[in-house]
Amino acid sequence: IWELKKDVYVVELDWYPDAPGEMVVLTCDTPEEDGITWTLDQSSEVLGSGKTLTIQVKEFGDAGQYTCHKGGEVLSHSLLLLHKKEDGIWSTDILKDQKEPKNKTFLRCEAKNYSGRFTCWWLTTISTDLTFSVKSSRGSSDPQGVTCGAATLSAERVRGDNKEYEYSVECQEDSACPAAEESLPIEVMVDAVHKLKYENYTSSFFIRDIIKPDPPKNLQLKPLKNSRQVEVSWEYPDTWSTPHSYFSLTFCVQVQGKSKREKKDRVFTDKTSATVICRKNASISVRAQDRYYSSSWSEWASVPCS
Amino acid sequence: RAVPGGSSPAWTQCQQLSQKLCTLAWSAHPLVGHMDLREEGDEETTNDVPHIQCGDGCDPQGLRDNSQFCLQRIHQGLIFYEKLLGSDIFTGEPSLLPDSPVGQLHASLLGLSQLLQPEGHHWETQQIPSLSPSQPWQRLLLRFKILRSLQAFVAVAARVFAHGAATLSP
């Protein structure tokens, strides 16, 4: 058993049939010594008396809010949550496995630049009685500070018969050094509580590996005289790190016909313009990627050829 | 070329070669995806790699003030990785794929380090980890780790030379 926060405790349980469970001793936070009784949740049934209560926690029915009273007055509360371990593996029932980039990916994170700011998100099908708490640091043995906000519900989607809820959180490294080569990964820890179930999820990454620039901005076409060719130009996204002579991007320009089956013409360039042939009913798209490190491409920015 | 006394390197040449190094480092080891290298206990060979850190003056302001600190750090790293790529970890069993660019990568690391430091001028270089051969089965994992680490190192070096070529070239 360990304390998650004031008056909230997590009991770690091996979850298999006929497991003996964990013996837990609760102590009433009071100077009083006698006349103390204990109840669980809203029930008025007295579970025991005395300054301490010893219970055997085996299942969710044994978890909940234990309250000690004296003469009708509440003295203190202890909320017991359960953390299940089945076959040596901690349960991951609350969050959905996003399976990208690999199985058992519950948290996904992205950064728009090298400033030390990043966003993480996760998915669940649970709509009520759900709380999240997020902590982060750079490195684990001698952690350096990363400040995370509160997790918020950022999207709701219908997937077949189920509703899926996306939560996200923004974090900022306290003393970020955008030009340095990271040697210690960022660690993100999410505590999830659904009713009386506790779970924790972690992710470890370098900012450089989660970079995904915003799409290029101000995408424009300029027809070239007496030619089917056009000059496409664009600019670095506002959110990208500066100066651009140091934090450089590379770009992919694609000409795509109306039909998805049509052959795509692609050009790669480090410049912020390119000359391409504009086919009728086609569209021109441009995306960006860090020039020197192969992290994710941005989403496409597109304009119609016409 | 960098010369004793701290005059400028051939920024444009260094830019071109460092960008080539980035391409080679990624073609030698595309994203592993299925292999999370951080889950595999860190071998000492990858613990001691020289990183370009915050105080090394490799940021745009530091380069403007005095690029020599940063160039020395990059040179140290190039020599370090050049030694590792020439070590038993890469030259031993199991065999690399026949068209592996590791040989080219090795040669390019040497080429860029020589651009930064001609013969006769010696910056202090970092101690190279023991090159005594690990057992063959451990090498694959070490190769992955070293190449991942090299990708991060050469990305910073390439940014430095690109910025230098754009803003510090005579």
Partner: antibody
């Protein structure tokens, strides 16, 4: 094309030493370790040791207890295997094989006889 | 040292028939990178050994697809789906998981 060409057959007296060479061509010599393997008449193959041509670092089969020395001459793209204190049971064909064991020299017969 | 035990010692086969050679390792050659560090060679009379299979099951360049390698970390098998006259010679397994690299004692394949 890749080629490993070994020196010619040798006849040695017990107690003497022999030095076999293996000249590599068609690839970057320093990119690949060089192994040495021997085969006594009618017997299986026996790995003797390996050298990294970049640094000259070696790993030997302990069975040969300091009798074997593998070296390289980078400028000549050549690896050498020297075996000392020869005895009759060292009569064998000695092969060099590039890392990966896909490329082997043609073999050098060393006969130890009084 | 890892001991490689090869069976049978001799294998007479009729052309067109399949053949199977077994190799047992005293220690698993399967490591956490998912690879099994085992080679198979054929040595034809008067020639240097030629690599047939590496990493237990990958055919070397130019090797006909009638040759295949399989197995677990310790029990390895080389199969020839239809033996041809040119397949005669001595077959060896070799582990390259640990120094010193070791070979099996060899299996002599001959045509009946």
């Amino acid at each position: 094309e890749f080629q490993l060409v070994q020196s010619g057959a040798e006849v040695k007296k017990p107690g003497a030493s022999v030095k076999v060479s293996c000249k590599a061509s068609g690839y970057s010599f320093t990119d690949h370790n060089m192994n040495w393997v021997r085969q006594a008449p009618g017997q299986s193959l026996e790995w003797m040791g390996v050298i990294n041509p970049n640094y000259g670092t070696t790993t030997y089969n302990q069975k040969f207890k300091g009798r074997v020395t593998i070296t390289v001459d980078q400028s000549a793209s050549t690896a050498y295997m020297e075996l000392s204190s020869l005895r009759s049971e060292d009569t064998a064909v000695y092969y060099c094989a590039r890392r990966g064991f896909a490329y082997w020299g043609q073999g050098t017969l060393v006969t130890v006889s009084s | 040292d890892i001991v490689m035990t090869q069976t049978p010692l001799s294998l007479p086969v009729t052309p067109g028939e399949p053949a199977s050679i077994s190799c047992r390792s005293s220690k698993s050659l399967l490591y956490k990178d998912g690879k099994t560090y085992l080679n198979w060679f054929l040595q034809k009379p008067g020639q240097s050994p030629q690599l047939l299979i590496y990493l237990m099951s990958t055919r070397a360049s130019g090797v006909p697809d009638r040759f295949s390698g399989s197995g677990s970390g310790t029990d390895l098998t080389l199969k020839i789906s239809r033996v041809e006259a040119e397949d005669v010679g001595v077959y060896y397994c070799q582990q390259i998981a640990e120094y010193p690299f070791t070979f099996g004692s060899g299996t002599k394949l001959e045509i009946k």
